[in-house]
């Protein structure tokens, strides 16, 4: 008994297209093997039609393709066009065509329905707008004119020129009677329905003498668009509907089971909680065009999504949509990486974001994610030496370790840094990836001082104390600007004695500046890292004034004012246009954005041993 | 909302055959599928067939315990669906039950309850030796 699995009968009509899904365990080794469809001769071989390896025979050339979902342990076969010569069996397969895996599957392609003469076919999209013409002799110019559905044996009335509008049909449909120079009324019907498809008879007049004229209206549901990612990366839905409904409301939902379709996001403000931090819905073109971009995929959401418009902001009967069918690769060529990273007040986050390794020399960018109106992704950084104003001095974007990771720092950290941001590049966009940061309670590891005043001339030395259980951790001081961070000598004064509970293992590790000039002003970072994982980081403000007195300064924790948010920011500080994702595509041209928030931020991260998909600033 | 209910269902010798409906209301699909599960007393809930038909076409699936003896067809018109059972034997005993979705996704296993939105209550078909 074969494990392949599939339809075992297939009926449809000459010119109409199949989609024949062929199910098969999906282990391994069947997930990577040949997939094909061959159709059974008369003396039992069966002839390959078209296989997964690229082959297609000259009989379905242009008019079929087979696609494998390995995740789902299926693989489709499409066929357009069918004629009668269709009919016959058929096997879908898996290895070689006589080896026994496989399905026997029969297609029956029997002659289409005729059509009555004279009958003019209407072949019209879901939710948009069909106009059936009926011509009409000069005789029947003042008489009645009507169109009717016919349901089964009978024709029933759906508008008629003296005011009847059926049911069904109430607030979207309307009958237009020509100048008088034409002969000729038009029945407009708006938001079309699936069920109103069928054959309908347009009649001027009433009398054996009456003008009749048979239309056959076929509402075409959209076939979904197979869309295939990788876990962990990210989707863009493309939503082009036309103009016509360029200022209705538009959404984005995903089918869950019957008619139910959940708004994942829509234009009126509303979006499902799962896609909190990891969806953006891009403002729409003038023609009312507008995308989606999912990023952190998930297992769960593969589906089945639909974008459209409708005044609801959701599906409903006569919406014109778009289709996709989503797939979330499970083998996935994006590394995990933490989804959520812990920090204090006062203290730092470690960020390690991926990218893809082939495009090491693309730019890389971090945004925060914010969730007003549709969601936008404004900039805060990026690896060309573009810092956010409000962030300087405290936001780091470094291209270490490399190979496809790079590293964002954030350190004094506020109850305002919690949130989503991004990790992006310029380069393959299915690579976005996000991360939550969460401001837990705690105090920083690392002690320094808060902000210091330096003395032309002097010598300045700044205290950073690391706790024992960096001990076995690399430390560092170095001096901020918007490249990165140069690290600067520092010299290890033995333990600290600024930690209870702390043995030896503790240090001291003190920042010397000799000679202090104007060019010493500036942020300074203490840290630690291991190779090149970076871990916490302490961040200090120094000021550099005259005076008369000479001698050296020796800063102390006591003598700091340790207020983590403070900033001391010289005048001369350039502020740069903030920078928003707006175009999921990224960066075809940089936009500039008004950003209203204004946010002091910084953080530590503490290790959730609780959860593999945590990472705390501290760990490695 | 819609609502399924079965008939058809009874006492049937070995050999013999019944035919079991699934009658739909409560709106009419366009496209869509109707499939027929059945559960023997302490056992899990199995497919029997469906029925699936989009744009004109119909394609029909069996389990492989069936073939050749059950056959799945539907009344357009009146929504229904039916199940031909022949040459029935004592292991064919279950509750029967009719499920049914609006165009389920093409990619997920039809032989799996999860694809199905609607239920019915079942239909007892019990055949003796």
């Known amino acids: 008994k074969s494990p392949i699995f599939g339809p075992e009968e297939v009926n449809s009509v000459e010119g109409n297209s199949v989609s024949i899904t062929c199910y098969y365990p999906p282990t391994s080794v069947n997930r990577h093997t040949r997939k094909y469809w061959c159709r059974q001769g008369a003396r039992g071989g069966c002839i390959t039609l078209i296989s997964s390896e690229g082959y297609v025979s000259s009989k379905y050339a242009g008019r079929a393709n087979l696609t494998n979902f390995p995740e789902n342990g299926t693989f489709v076969v499409n066929i357009a066009q069918l004629s009668q010569d269709d009919s016959g069996r058929y096997k879908c397969g898996l290895g070689i065509n006589s080896r026994g895996l496989s399905f026997d599957v029969s297609l029956e392609v029997s002659q289409g329905p005729g059509l009555l003469n004279d009958t003019k076919v209407y072949t019209v999209d879901l939710g948009r707008t069909v106009t059936i013409n009926c011509p009409f002799k000069t005789e029947n110019a003042q008489k009645r004119k009507s169109l009717y559905k016919q349901i089964g044996l009978y024709p029933v009335l759906v508008i008629d020129s003296s005011g009847y509008v059926n049911p069904n049909y109430t607030g979207r449909i309307r009958l237009d009677i020509q100048g008088t120079g034409q002969l000729l009324f038009s029945v407009v019907i708006n938001q079309l329905r699936l069920s109103d498809a069928g054959q309908y008879l347009c009649q001027a007049g009433d009398d054996s003498n009456s003008n009749k004229k048979n239309a056959d209206l076929q509402v075409l549901k959209p076939e979904p668009e197979l869309v295939y990612e990788d876990l962990r990366g990210s989707v863009t839905f493309h939503c082009a509907l036309g103009p016509e409904v360029a200022n209705v409301a538009k959404f984005l939902c995903r089918q869950s089971s019957g008619e139910n379709c959940d708004v994942v996001v829509n234009t009126l403000g509303k979006r499902a909680p799962a896609f909190e931090g990891r969806i953006l819905l891009n403002p729409q073109d003038k023609d009312g065009s507008f995308s989606v971009v999912i990023t952190g995929l998930r297992k769960e959401d593969a589906g089945r999504y639909l974008c459209g418009a409708h005044s609801d902001g959701q599906l409903q009967e006569g919406s014109p949509i778009q289709a996709w069918q989503l797939f979330v690769n499970e083998e996935s060529t994006i590394p995990r990486s933490p989804t959520v990273v812990k920090g204090v007040a006062g203290g730092s986050v470690a960020v390690l974001c991926p990218y893809n390794r082939k495009e090491s020399k693309s730019i890389k960018y971090w945004c925060l994610w914010e969730g007003a109106q549709n969601g936008r992704c404004p900039l805060l950084v990026d690896s060309e030496g573009w810092v956010k104003a409000q962030y300087e001095g405290r936001l780091s974007l470094l291209e270490e370790p490399g190979n496809g990771t790079f590293t964002v720092i954030l350190n004094q950290l506020t109850s305002r840094d919690a949130g989503f941001y991004w990790c992006l590049t310029n380069g393959d966009t299915l690579w976005r990836t996000t991360v939550e940061i969460k401001i837990i309670e705690g105090e920083p590891n690392l002690k320094v001082p808060g902000n210091v005043t330096a003395v032309l001339g002097e010598t300045l030395k700044v205290p950073c104390h690391f706790p024992c259980k960096f001990s076995s951790y690399e430390k560092y001081w170095c001096k901020w600007n918007n490249t990165g961070c140069q690290a600067l000598p520092s010299q290890d004064e033995g333990p600290s004695k600024a930690f209870v509970n702390c043995d030896e293992n503790s240090r001291l590790v003190s920042l010397t500046l000799n000679l202090v000039t104007r060019a010493d002003e500036g942020w300074y970072w203490c840290g630690v890292k291991q190779g090149h994982f970076y871990g916490e980081t302490a961040a200090v403000y120094v000021a550099v004034e005259e005076r008369k007195a000479a001698g050296s300064r020796d800063v102390s924790l006591a003598k700091a004012d340790a207020a983590p948010d403070e900033k001391v920011l010289d005048s001369g500080f350039r502020e740069i246009e903030n920078k928003a994702i707006q175009d999921p595509r990224l960066f075809a041209e940089e936009k500039a954005v008004a950003d209203t928030r204004d946010q002091a931020d910084g953080s530590r991260a503490s290790v959730d041993s609780g959860s593999s998909e945590e990472q705390g600033g501290s760990s490695r | 909302e819609v609502q399924l209910v079965e008939s058809g269902g009874g006492l049937v010798q070995a050999g013999g055959s019944l035919r079991l409906s699934c009658a739909a209301s409560?709106?009419?699909?366009?496209?869509?599928?109707m499939g027929w599960f059945r559960q023997a007393p302490g056992k899990e809930r199995e497919f029997v067939a469906a029925?699936?038909?989009?744009?004109?076409?119909?394609?029909?699936y069996y389990a492989e315990s069936v073939k050749g003896r059950f056959a799945i067809s539907r009344d357009n018109a009146k929504t229904t669906a039916y199940l031909q059972m022949g040459s029935l034997n004592p292991e064919d005993t279950a509750l029967y039950y009719c499920?049914?979705?609006?165009?389920?996704?093409?990619?997920?296993?039809?032989?799996?309850?999860?694809?199905?939105?609607?239920w019915g209550q079942g239909t007892l078909v019990t055949v003796s030796s």
């Open positions: 409560g709106r009419t699909f366009s496209s869509g599928i």
């Open positions: 499920a049914a979705d609006e165009s389920p996704s093409r990619y997920i296993d039809l032989r799996r309850p999860a694809p199905y939105h609607y």
């Open positions: 029925i699936e038909w989009s744009g004109g076409n119909t394609y029909k």
